[in-house]
Amino acid sequence: QPSVSPGEPSPPSIHPAKSELIVRVGNEIRLLCIDPGFVKWTFEILDETNENKQNEWITEKAEATNTGKYTCTNKHGLSSSIYVFVRDPAKLFLVDRSLYGKEDNDTLVRCPLTDPEVTSYSLKGCQGKPLPKDLRFVPDPKAGITIKSVKRAYHRLCLHCSADQEGKSVLSDKFILKVRPAFKAVPVVSVSKASYLLREGEEFTVTCTIKDVSSSVYSTWKRENSQTKLQEKYNSWHHGDFNYERQATLTISSARVNDSGVFMCYANNTFGSANVTTTLEVVDKGFINIFPMINTTVFVNDGENVDLIVEYEAFPKPEHQQWIYMNRTFTDKWEDYPKSENESNIRYVSELHLTRLKGTEGGTYTFLVSNSDVNASIAFNVYVNTKPEILTYDRLVNGMLQCVAAGFPEPTIDWYFCPGTEQRCSASVLPVDVQTLNASGPPFGKLVVQSSIDSSAFKHNGTVECKAYNDVGKTSAYFNFAFKGNNKEQIHPHTLFTP
């Protein structure tokens, strides 16, 4: 008997005292458990377990399915076991055909033998096909055949357990290996839209797509900074063997302003985790916010082009847009387009293209936009810069020389006297009177300036130059003087454009 210290409990003894035993099919299995504190016999094979409270286990007519491990346990929880093979030439293998293997792990093809003395216990491919070259296995008559380090490529592999019995090869029922892939990367998560803008009462629905190699990937919708369980619905598909897709749809049937926030779709597997967020903004009503892309006060030179550009946020989407000038609506010369093609885009651009502007086309240009909730507008004040134009140049009855010029910005009029026939007038003459004639008139268009000098100051023949100029350009008019006796006469007044 096993040597044990006095008083120390020892395991039961089983008779016959063998680790393994062969019994022929149809013969009796008789096993005796000797122990003063005998409790029970248990029998295990594949997924089957039986118990017996008698100290002698008797199976009168042994069958192949009685092959297995018989364990005797005493009241101290100590046990001894014997493995019995019931040799049945007609049933060499006990088979549990379910065969799942986790990638990179070992898996057991459960085909224990009923006769351990057969030879060449191994695996074979179905229909004579060879096994994958890198497939390694370890046979164990009591358990089956262990496939080492299962590869993803073995998925759906058809196998038989095989052994040579009396010189003939015997095959078990077939097994189909189903490989559960190992997670070698984090799940791939994406969201239907990165942000949502809704009005109160509207439905919020967002879908997260989770992609991984198998359905055992975990996923959930979470609200940031909240533990509340969200209601989600799932749809899933297997696209081929190791391409699993799940769609998790989160819905709030009637969104409220306080539902605004960041929602996270979180997924994890044994490799790691991944997440993606979407932002929900719920507003009590729609809005339009306009942002001018250029200054709303615009100065442009006569004959040049200008583009009036606005960006605006509109939610819900804009329904009507128009550009107006002097109560007239532009039907062309403008375009309106979304800032991006993104589905959640709420930003738009509107451009009014003004070409070859005339001095008379200055004024207020207004952009108006509306949606189902609000209207908004923005005005541009357009000033057309024009080169001064000398409207009149006269000698008045009171002996004054008067020059009236129009332009924008307001022209400045300078006077010069040129003695004799010289055209180079350098001696400046101070005006007697300068007035801006339409300063209180309409705010756009040309400004008219009138300037006068006293001609009595001139004692010699010569030319007087009236020079009107601003930031855009200058124009001159000339007065020629000749003395006849004591009388001074204006002769040949003419203008000279000086760019």
């Epitope: 008779h15 680790s19 022929r24 013969n27 003395e117």
Partner: antibody, heavy 121, light 107 residues
Framework: EVQLVESGGGLVQPGGSLRLSCAAS????????MDWVRQAPGKGLEWVGR??????????EYAASVKGRFTISRDDSKNSLYLQMNSLKTEDTAVYYC????????????WGRGTLVTVSS | DIQMTQSPSSLSASVGDRVTITCRAS??????LNWYQQKPGKAPKLLIY???SLQSGVPSRFSGSGSGTDFTLTISSLQPEDFATYYC?????????FGGGTKVEIK
Amino acid sequence: EVQLVESGGGLVQPGGSLRLSCAASGFTFSDADMDWVRQAPGKGLEWVGRTRNKAGSYTTEYAASVKGRFTISRDDSKNSLYLQMNSLKTEDTAVYYCAREPKYWIDFDLWGRGTLVTVSS
Amino acid sequence: DIQMTQSPSSLSASVGDRVTITCRASQSISSYLNWYQQKPGKAPKLLIYAASSLQSGVPSRFSGSGSGTDFTLTISSLQPEDFATYYCQQSYIAPYTFGGGTKVEIK
């Protein structure tokens, strides 16, 4: 060649001791459960005792007639089985056989030729 | 201990005879019974194990039967080399006891 060869027999006085050896060859000795069987001159076979292999935790069992006097041991590294006999009695005179058990049954499928132990004053 | 009783203790037979030897156990030993043949000055030789399984290399004229307490060894046609002593042995519970033996002699 698969064989068992006993040695160590001889004449010994009552109360004396003797150690028998059994050398195994041609098979994996460490896997086998091993027994000693004796046969007194002109008599039948009597089982003496056995030792299990490592899987059987090297457990030993003895016949009542020798229990406490005889000890069976083994040295797997030397492929050897031993029978230490103490307090020998005249009735222990016999041919002592070393025998092998097969893996899956208790029987004696291989025997040595035996060694004679004579206990006499 | 389990007692094994063999009968007859001896028998005389001629070459070609059918010979039957019986062995009875004092309690049920299922099929845990073995038969051995021993010739003078030689070690025993295993003939039958597990009551009815023929050991490799043993002629098929030897057969065994029985289960529980009663067992039989049959030699269907006695051959000159079969004259020997035959022993049964139970291998259910230690001590693994032998029967007293049956000596088969030439008539």
